[in-house]
């Protein structure tokens, strides 16, 4: 087949036609439609929305749209036995109770089925004891407490502020420290930007607002009862005691009004330094326990949530490719929300909906993409990326053979300052080239490209004149595709100015105040940032699905591999004596990176020169590009994390949201000076260098001439 046979529109107009069809007004309309009631995973409302999306995607013109259901472990509060935290006096009387629900936002007072704030998958329990304030509950915060301040959290209830790291890591750290309960709260220092009013008058978190969220440590497992396999009708399910990643101690989230009541009475040690102080009018004493007058008072948690196997529904839409129908480009984002989902996820789902509509319009005019595009509306992302992971587990054999790329589409905005992109290095050039062709929506950049405003506002720390592109971590639905299956992945959204707004995420994240009005009044009244994100996400999908040669540049991987090798080497070199004693060498890794660089360079030269009219050679070169990401997968996975199999990138062991490079080596080196058996510890470092070097070399060889 001729390479243009996929379309009846001249190739250079394809992308333009697609982009021109995207309309801000439609995204606005879709967002409104998706946010009028809650769409909690496992509820009838979210099933109805799945069926609505299925119906609309069919109307838009997709070839097929199916629901894929799974029965997974979810978690809900007990409707008749609410969760709360008390301060109790010496007689056991409750003298203060945290609130049972958030004050409903204006206009939503009569909406039913708003799930009250809770920590999903918390076990039941009513622990009582003294409180210890543990800052953000990061690894380094517990090091400070235990090693420097000699404060023992064993048998204590800890209170931690949200932010900096994934909440599941906080809970894991608290468990390891021996705590018997965890209270999570949003401090105004992290969730209240100065000079901005609280919702409903602005985009800041009010004192009664609370962040919901799961507290699992799944490490990529998906449904806790069926790790590695789909939670289908004939699934074998583990017992709850063997479930993956469940917390073992009660956990509950509160807002800063309630946190004030708990923290204002804290006694014991003063905070170690100013980084432990938030913005409440409290001393931020660490404890344990309350100060003098209140020393006989204790904190008691009342947690009655239940874990239930519940049916969830993904929507999977297919637009069949005309030339390479067995090559899949996937655009996926989740549909389930904690409450209204004004930003998370529906600002993303509305963009996906408009992208599907635009592709459908082109298809109705006779166009088809070269490769198959799959569109996904994932369920139960908020409960641990469950919908996407179960679908990928069910379809893993197809995906590992046919998956070209995955583009994630959760929240389109977390601010309105500039673009934010996290992706595989293979996509750097695609993103650069695409954003140079798109108009910037930013004030002061009229008539300028998105690339220009993005580069100005978020410059690369390494390369002048280029924008920052970050590593993929986790905490979203690309995880299974990238970290487990090795499918090239990327994500894009509009973000805040990290320089001036140092709060974590956006203030109303996972609260009842994430409404349509939040977006329409305060973040993006014209929906111009949503439109830009639609153009970036949709443009990436278009290019990945339609370009004759896959728009991947393997040379960019070579550059970052060298950077990551330098970084991990410098970490190791903080222990020069031990490296000498245990004969630790990075030579093999640097050699492999050098080989990769040379082979990638030669491959790129061949890519420029080969005969693109020869479909066999074209397919061969494209397959080498497609399978390069796959080549970084170690089938054995990372130590104790079998579903994190990518050797170059994994979610940080200390923060699921963050990406770590050469994670196997990094984790082997982490806190190595405290290991009881240094010989064994440095032996593991050497083994991880070996695995990394082998993997880089093996990946390089996939780019060599095939014969």
């Amino acid at each position: 087949k001729s390479s243009n046979e996929a379309t009846n529109i001249t190739p250079k107009h394809n992308m333009k036609a697609f982009l021109d069809e995207l309309k801000a007004e439609n995204i606005k309309k879709f967002l409104y439609n998706f946010t009028q009631i809650p769409h909690l995973a496992g509820t009838e409302q979210n099933f109805q929305l799945a069926k609505q999306i299925q119906s609309q995607w069919k109307e838009f013109g997709l070839d097929s749209v199916e629901l894929a259901h799974y029965d997974v472990l979810l978690s809900y509060p007990n409707k008749t036995h609410p969760n709360y935290i008390s301060i109790i006096n010496e007689d056991g009387n409750e003298i203060f109770n945290t609130s049972l629900f958030e004050p409903p936002p204006p206009g939503y007072e009569n909406v039913s089925d708003i799930v009250p704030p809770f920590s999903a998958f918390s076990p039941q329990g009513m622990p009582e004891g003294d409180l210890v304030y543990v800052n953000y509950a990061r690894t380094e915060d517990f090091f400070k407490l235990e090693r420097d301040m000699k404060i023992n959290c064993s048998g204590k209830i800890v209170i931690a502020r949200y932010g900096k790291v994934f909440r599941g890591n906080k809970v894991k750290n608290a468990q390891l420290a021996g705590a018997k309960g965890v209270i999570l709260y949003s401090d105004p220092a992290d969730y209240f930007a100065p000079g901005v009013k609280s919702y409903p008058d602005g985009w800041n978190l009010p004192g009664g607002g609370v962040q919901r969220g799961n507290i699992l440590n799944l490490n990529g497992a998906g449904d806790p009862l069926t790790p590695g396999y789909p939670a289908n009708e004939y699934a074998y399910r583990r017992g709850i005691a063997e479930a993956v990643g469940l917390p073992s101690i009660p956990v509950h989230p509160i807002g800063y009004y309630d946190a004030q009541k708990l923290l204002e009475k804290m006694g014991g040690s003063a905070p170690p330094d100013s980084s432990w102080r938030g913005s409440l009018k409290v001393p931020y004493n660490v404890g344990p326990g309350f100060t003098g007058n209140f020393s006989t008072q204790k904190v008691k948690m009342h947690i009655h949530s239940t874990n239930e196997v519940t049916r969830i529904y993904n929507v999977i839409g297919t637009l069949r490719g005309a030339v390479e129908p067995d090559r899949y480009v996937i655009l996926g984002g989740h549909r389930d929300s904690w409450v209204f989902g004004g930003i998370d996820p529906q600002s993303g789902a509305a963009v996906v909906h408009e992208i599907v509509r635009s592709f459908g319009t082109l298809k109705k005019e006779g166009w088809r993409p070269r490769r198959t595009i799959l569109f996904a509306s994932w369920d139960a992302e908020e409960f641990g990326l469950l919908g996407s992971t179960e679908w990928a587990e069910e379809n893993s054999r197809l995906l590992q053979e046919r998956g070209v790329a995955y583009i994630n589409a959760d929240s389109s905005i977390e601010g309105n300052y500039t673009l934010r992109v996290d992706c595989t290095p293979l996509m750097y050039s695609l993103v650069h080239n695409l954003t140079k062709e798109l108009k910037s929506p930013d004030e002061g950049f009229e008539g300028k490209s998105l690339y220009e405003s993005w580069t100005k506002k978020s410059p690369s720390p390494e390369f002048s004149g280029m924008p920052r592109i970050s590593k993929l971590g986790s905490g979203n639905d690309f995880e299974v595709f990238f970290q487990r299956l090795g499918i090239a992945s990327g994500r894009a959204r509009y973000t805040k100015n990290w320089e001036t707004n140092k709060f974590s995420g956006y203030p109303l994240y996972h609260s009842v105040y994430e409404t349509y009005e939040l977006v329409e009044k305060f973040y993006d009244p014209m929906f111009k940032y949503h439109l830009t994100v639609a153009q970036v996400r949709g443009g990436m999908v278009f290019e990945l699905a339609n370009s004759i040669v896959l728009p991947f540049d393997c040379r960019d991987y070579a550059v970052v591999l060298r950077k990551y090798a330098d970084k991990i080497y410098s970490i190791s070199m903080k222990h020069p004596q031990e490296m000498k004693t245990y004969s630790v060498s990075f030579d093999s890794l640097f050699s492999a990176v050098k080989n990769f660089t040379e082979i990638a360079s030669k491959f790129s030269e061949r890519l420029q020169d080969f005969d693109k009219s020869n479909p066999i050679v074209l397919r061969m070169m494209n397959d080498q590009l497609m399978f390069l990401e796959r080549a970084f997968i170690d089938p054995l996975g990372l130590p104790d994390r079998p579903f994190y199999r990518h050797v170059i990138y994994a979610p940080s062991s200390h923060n699921k949201y963050a990406g770590e490079s050469f994670p196997g080596i990094y984790d082997a080196l982490f806190d190595i000076e405290s290991k009881v058996d240094p010989s064994k510890a440095w032996g593991e470092v050497k083994r991880q260098i070996y695995v990394a070097a082998f993997t880089v070399q093996a990946a390089a060889e996939t780019l060599s001439e095939v014969a």
């Epitope: 203060f96 109770n97 049972l100 607002g209």
Partner: antibody
């Protein structure tokens, strides 16, 4: 305009019970803590009780503790005060008042009803 | 006997400035609890005049101002007008009583 309207006052004998209601004309009722404050005619104000917006916390003045119960029904935008074992010294105009901060108990009163007179007399 | 002490009455001629004091103790105002002020015109319900020591709700003229220092607070009224004639109450929180406390009220007479 936002309004609070008390009802249920009247003459009652000592030892008997009475239930006061306070109807709010706004949907945002469910986001505010609510108080009862009383005033003996010609005298000063005395705070009686408060309930948080969600009912999770209720606090009482020592003079009424164990006898009075404050409650609310957010679906009806209504606040209640159940008064048992009434005494002659409970005679007063009873005002319902809204707490000054949405979603919190800041313990001041930014909106008052007109009051309902309770007379405890044999 | 009220927990917060106010003068029973104050007076002033139209246009003058008057202040009403409110004295507490280390368990209320002195414990850094906020002070609020209410105006009660004859035959009506009280109305919030000053909240959190020195803030005026919308609609309250800037002739009214509040301050707090140590264990006491005060309300100042400048440019006295005839319709300012009313009872004025201060209010705070007391951590010994674990409850809201009021002053006994001050009757302002405009001469």
């Amino acid at each position: 305009e936002v309004q609070l309207v008390e009802s249920g006052g009247g003459v009652v004998q000592p030892g008997r019970s009475l239930r006061l209601s306070c109807a709010a004309s706004v949907r945002t009722f469910s986001g505010y803590g609510m108080h009862w404050v009383r005033q003996v005619p010609g005298k000063g104000l005395e705070w009686v009780a408060v309930i948080s917006y969600d009912g999770s916390n209720r606090y009482y003045a020592d003079s009424v503790k164990g006898r009075f119960t404050i409650s609310r029904d957010n679906s009806k935008n209504t606040l209640y005060l159940q008064m048992n074992s009434l005494r002659t010294e409970d005679t007063a105009v009873y005002y319902c008042a809204r707490d000054g901060n949405w979603g919190s108990l800041d313990l001041y009163f930014d909106l008052w009803g007109r009051g309902t007179l309770v007379t405890v007399s044999s | 006997q009220s927990v917060l002490t106010q003068p029973p009455s104050v007076s002033g001629a139209p246009g003058q400035r008057v202040t009403i004091s409110c004295t507490g103790s280390s368990s209320n105002i002195g414990a850094d609890y906020d002070v609020h002020w209410y105006q009660q015109l004859p035959g009506t319900a009280p109305k919030l005049l000053i909240y959190v020591n020195n803030n005026r709700p919308s609609g309250v003229p800037d002739r009214f101002s509040g301050s707090r220092s140590g264990t006491s607070a005060s309300l100042a009224i400048t440019g006295l007008q005839a319709d300012d004639e009313a009872d004025y109450y201060c209010q705070s929180y007391d951590n010994t009583l674990s409850g809201v406390v009021f002053g006994g009220g001050t009757k302002l007479t405009v001469l």
